[in-house]
Amino acid sequence: QAAPFPELCSYTWEAVDTKNNVLYKINICGSVDIVQCGPSSAVCMHDLKTRTYHSVGDSVLRSATRSLLEFNTTVSCDQQGTNHRVQSSIAFLCGKTLGTPEFVTATECVHYFEWRTTAACKKDIFKANKEVPCYVFDEELRKHDLNPLIKLSGAYLVDDSDPDTSLFINVCRDIDTLRDPGSQLRACPPGTAACLVRGHQAFDVGQPRDGLKLVRKDRLVLSYVREEAGKLDFCDGHSPAVTITFVCPSERREGTIPKLTAKSNCRYEIEWITEYACHRDYLESKTCSLSGEQQDVSIDLTPLAQSGGSSYISDGKEYLFYLNVCGETEIQFCNKKQAAVCQVKKSDTSQVKAAGRYHNQTLRYSDGDLTLIYFGGDECSSGFQRMSVINFECNKTAGNDGKGTPVFTGEVDCTYFFTWDTEYACVKEKEDLLCGATDGKKRYDLSALVRHAEPEQNWEAVDGSQTETEKKHFFINICHRVLQEGKARGCPEDAAVCAVDKNGSKNLGKFISSPMKEKGNIQLSYSDGDDCGHGKKIKTNITLVCKPGDLESAPVLRTSGEGGCFYEFEWHTAAACVLSKTEGENCTVFDSQAGFSFDLSPLTKKNGAYKVETKKYDFYINVCGPVSVSPCQPDSGACQVAKSDEKTWNLGLSNAKLSYYDGMIQLNYRGGTPYNNERHTPRATLITFLCDRDAGVGFPEYQEEDNSTYNFRWYTSYACPEEP
């Protein structure tokens, strides 16, 4: 029997039942290779509470349709007196990526999963040349899912200070150049997930091979390698490779675009601080609303409830389905059953079944999917209790006053599936919006203006037009809602601009769209504020103008008009200046745009060196000066000593030329002991200094990701911006 979904065959997939602390391993084409589950297990269940393993699906006992895969076992299970076999059921839906299997529910006998994946699509429109699994579970069974970052067309431009080259990447899959309007990517070879553009030429520097890996808590790594044999002539004999490290931001660092942290010998190291690297809580509720602090999620489906005897009706060929959410169906022939979903046979309306009961309800927000599950319906002939799964989709323009209507999509073993497009399922994800703008290779980053939490305070705009008695206070945050503190305490929760006067507070707009570059300035538009009459809502425009060296000045109110429906602010700030690379001398560097100066000379050791010890080597490093440690060469800025035989390598000659770009200070030592390759490439060292105000001097850390380049990172308070 041919594999039903060949794209999914190369990997063993994972799904989790968080409530019961159970990890499932799934291999849909072969076996999972877990001894405790036996040689032919396709679905292996690991109960972490009891530390036991059970096979809940056998690869030999597989049956498949276009949208359903069932794995039976020979193990008996007892459900309400009927004798069944344990089985797993995976319902497939068309998705835009390979996706992830999602645990839905489990009964005594059946383990239900749902999987939105390109493999289940009738057409190949979303299928990739190369794609790898893009999620992982950590030790606490929390899911880290990068699927939302996958681009279906185009690519991400990696932030790099080199004006002559551009590195484009996709996440977990190759770059689709055909559907991308940007001409730069057209030349990228098929299959590449990392494409280096130099002039009019494009080179494949990495293709996806292995799935996403969790290397540390909240640090995910994706590695791309070049499959082709031929070497690239600018790589000094090395094979190109790309390592992307996704980092969950701490409170101090918000999401960013991918940043190149090292690129010696075509070994490209990229760091991407993104909320998608954080674990995504599975939010569940037994009511019709749920909220999750971490994801900034708030969902309330109660407006969808029907009352006064009416229900939603969904046509299912042989059957009609009467549904209500957040309440029972109140139609005559269903109400004795306490049904939320009621199934009525068209040809014989006396045949009525509850396809899920109101009091057996679970609302789940998981990885961007909003699902309402009703359990415990009437039994099918097999003894299983009917169940309904409603998948909600956000649709801001849904009919029926935004409520929309449920649509029956199919039935799998007495489980009934519906989709429901409604505006009440719209959830704004923070990470969807960037707090910056791009104009070709020019980058603008407004994140320095964001106020996150106390003790920080909102920006207050200057308004010279009013007398003290009629004074309005205008509180503004950038790419974030205003902090509810001080005079802004009463501001509406999701307002990004808020006006406060003696009559109360007003929402002047929410952060709904990313900043844009317009006419040399950055424009930030906040919309969907409070009502201002005639069915209109208040809108605010902020024009940010580059003012080098100034991150302190406040925004100024320029105009307010259209009967209080429109406000315009102007803000002269260094955050609106283009990011540029600057070089310095004598262990100092000055960022003229932002007005920051950095001096790392306190890190220079007059005698000795900083030591980094690994199992095989000792590394000695100095900052802006030579290491004075035997057996290192006297002029080396960094040196490597083998523990086994004290063999020594110079990792680069010392210098004091710091470079600064977008919050990263770097020191490059070149011209070390040559490698033993055809080109005899000299060894080099790159030290990246990162700001941490508590670190003091700090110490160097070796990044063990790549053996052919020597990359160190160094947290230090001396890398934190100081006003000159």
Epitope: K217, D218, V247, E613, T614, K615, A695, G698, F699, E701
Partner: nanobody
């Protein structure tokens, strides 16, 4: 897999001393650099000290330099933190952590963590 168990915390007057211990299970203890971190209520986890796998390299946070000493005994699979001249601002839960191969300042780079031991310094 490495499991870490801290002990030695408690209540101590300002100026007093404590010695924290962190016992590791597993035969590969000497493959790991070890670190001590602390977390006060409502605050982020902060670096305190780190020691390389052999014990040959140690680094400390500025706030504890000269007062705290980190050491390890690979034969006993244990790492220690000797805390002298304790101050009320040293009050926190102290965590022991293990990182494969080499040391780091960043708590997110550590592979294994203990459950923590409470240290309270009264004024």
């Amino acid at each position: 897999e490495v499991q870490l168990v801290e002990s030695g915390g408690g209540l101590v007057p300002a100026g007093g001393s404590l010695r924290l211990s962190c016992a590791a299970s597993g035969r590969t203890f000497s493959n790991y650099a070890m670190g001590w971190f602390r977390q006060a209520p409502g605050k982020e986890r902060k670096f305190v000290a780190t020691i390389s796998w052999s014990g040959g390299v140690t680094y400390y946070a500025d706030s504890v330099k000269g007062r705290f000493t980190i050491s390890r005994d690979n034969a006993k699979n244990t790492v220690y933190l000797l805390m002298n001249s304790l101050k009320p601002e040293d009050t926190a839960v102290y965590y022991c952590a293990a990182k494969r191969d080499s040391s780091s300042y960043d708590h997110r780079r550590y592979d294994y963590w203990g459950q923590g031991t409470q240290v309270t310094v009264s004024s």
